[in-house]
């Protein structure tokens, strides 16, 4: 199922089919009898209810408001209302560039490193069933590719691959021919220098715990996009049902690298969890860094120097 239109501000190009899908769609099916209304407001007009009689270009289906096609005068605010649920979008329809196969303001930019995997797939899931054919253009010159339903480029990037790639889907609706264009500006760059991934904090951590309680071991690293962070521990003795790895959390740093953290959760700590190594590793194609955690019973704390302790 096509996801709903959650972006509140949308820019589209005149002359193309376009749709808005509200985000309480599953709810709308449950309450079929509830009144569902679409409204538009722009400049002089306040909240005009939309229906197929408003314009021959507008179609309403369950959760979707369709434009066949969208035109400059469709610019404005749109509202979907159902009971106490309201969703609002601000739609800006821009002029098509008549001298090019794409409109510069509607281009998605992508940076690809040379020799890295480079892929463009022409897909449009919402209009999929109506699409007769799809063409892929590079700098407005048609590329001859085998598949005319979903043309695809899959290769290792070369500098000559740089350019504007436009997927143009041709579709029929009510006897008229329409097209939808999606353009990518592909820039090919030199290999970006990778950092040596590093785990944050001390390499050996003794963690004071109580039997029967839970503990969360947090492992954080600074790494490259393709590097990985994972836990390894004594599973040779069989899987411990009390040990759970949480999903990795990852945020980008201002320098374009990544800060990742992965938590190992140990529930209902038992004797078998004490004095064994729980190893967290960050790995890249260039090497690894590992830090270890050892769970120690609180009563035994006195035996360990204070500087190796984490709480």
């Amino acid at each position: 199922a096509e996801s709903c239109t959650s972006r509140p501000h949308i820019t589209v190009v005149e002359g193309e089919p376009f749709y808005l899908k509200h985000c309480s769609c599953s709810l709308a099916h449950e309450i079929e009898t509830t009144t569902k209304s679409w409204y538009k407001s722009s400049g002089s007009q306040e909240h005009v209810e939309l229906n197929p009689r408003s314009s021959s270009r507008i179609a309403l289906h369950d959760c979707v408001l369709e434009f066949w096609p969208v035109e400059l005068n469709d610019t404005g605010s749109y509202f979907f209302q159902m009971k106490n649920y309201t969703q609002k979008w601000k739609l800006n329809v821009i002029r098509r560039n008549k001298h090019s196969c794409f409109t510069e303001r509607q281009v998605t930019s992508k940076i690809v490193e040379v020799k890295k995997f480079f892929q463009i797939t022409c897909e449009n899931s919402y209009y999929q069933t109506l699409v007769n054919s799809t063409s892929l253009y590079k700098n407005c010159k048609k590329l001859l590719l085998e598949n005319n339903k979903n043309p695809t480029i899959k290769k290792n990037a070369e500098f000559e691959d740089q350019g504007y790639y436009s997927c143009v889907h041709f579709l029929h609706h009510n006897g008229k021919l329409f097209n939808i264009t999606k353009t990518f500006n592909i820039t090919i760059v030199e290999d970006r220098s990778n950092i040596v991934p590093v785990l944050l904090g001390p390499k050996l951590n003794h963690v004071a715990v109580e039997l029967g309680k839970n503990v969360r071991l947090n492992c954080s690293a600074l790494l490259n996009e393709e590097d990985v962070i994972y836990w390894m521990f004594g599973e040779e003795n069989g899987s411990d049902p009390n040990i759970h790895e949480e999903k990795e959390m990852r945020i980008m740093t201002p320098e374009g690298k990544w800060h990742a953290s992965k938590v190992l959760r140990i529930e209902n700590i038992g004797e078998s969890n004490l004095n064994v190594l729980y190893n967290c590793t960050v790995a890249s194609t260039g090497g690894t860094d590992t830090k270890s955690f050892i769970l120690v019973r609180k009563a035994d704390m006195a035996d360990i120097p204070g500087h190796v302790f984490t709480r």
Partner: nanobody
């Protein structure tokens, strides 16, 4: 020559199965701990299953009881049998070695679970 080549992905409905393969050229996998990683859209690569040189296996909670990792040392190939697939299993799947520097990544294989 790509050192790791994943294959076997596809579009399936919830509850269905897939078997992924990872053919390793170059270094033999028999001496390495090998793992399968899942990369959901916009996320990092999460290790979901691994197998030691001796054949001991480990799975994360999200796949335990549904996925099975195995390897064929003679064919230098790692496998992931995925049963009872659900929507959260959607992503690109990669294999790689653990416990040392990673091999160069393959292109991965896309698994899409959709109703």
């Amino acid at each position: 020559d790509v050192p790791l080549q994943e294959s076997g992905g596809g579009l399936v409905q919830p509850g269905q199965s897939l078997r992924l393969s990872c053919a390793a050229s170059g270094s033999p996998i028999r001496f390495s701990v090998m793992g399968w990683f899942q990369q959901a859209p916009g996320k990092g690569r999460d290790l979901i299953a691994r197998i030691t040189s001796g054949g001991i296996v480990y799975y994360t909670d999200s796949v335990k009881g549904r996925f099975t990792i195995s390897k064929d040392n003679a064919k230098n190939t790692l496998y992931l049998q995925m049963n009872s697939l659900n929507l959260e299993d959607t992503g690109v799947y990669y294999c790689n070695r653990l416990g040392g520097a990673l091999f160069d990544w393959g292109q991965g294989t896309q698994v899409t679970v959709s109703s």
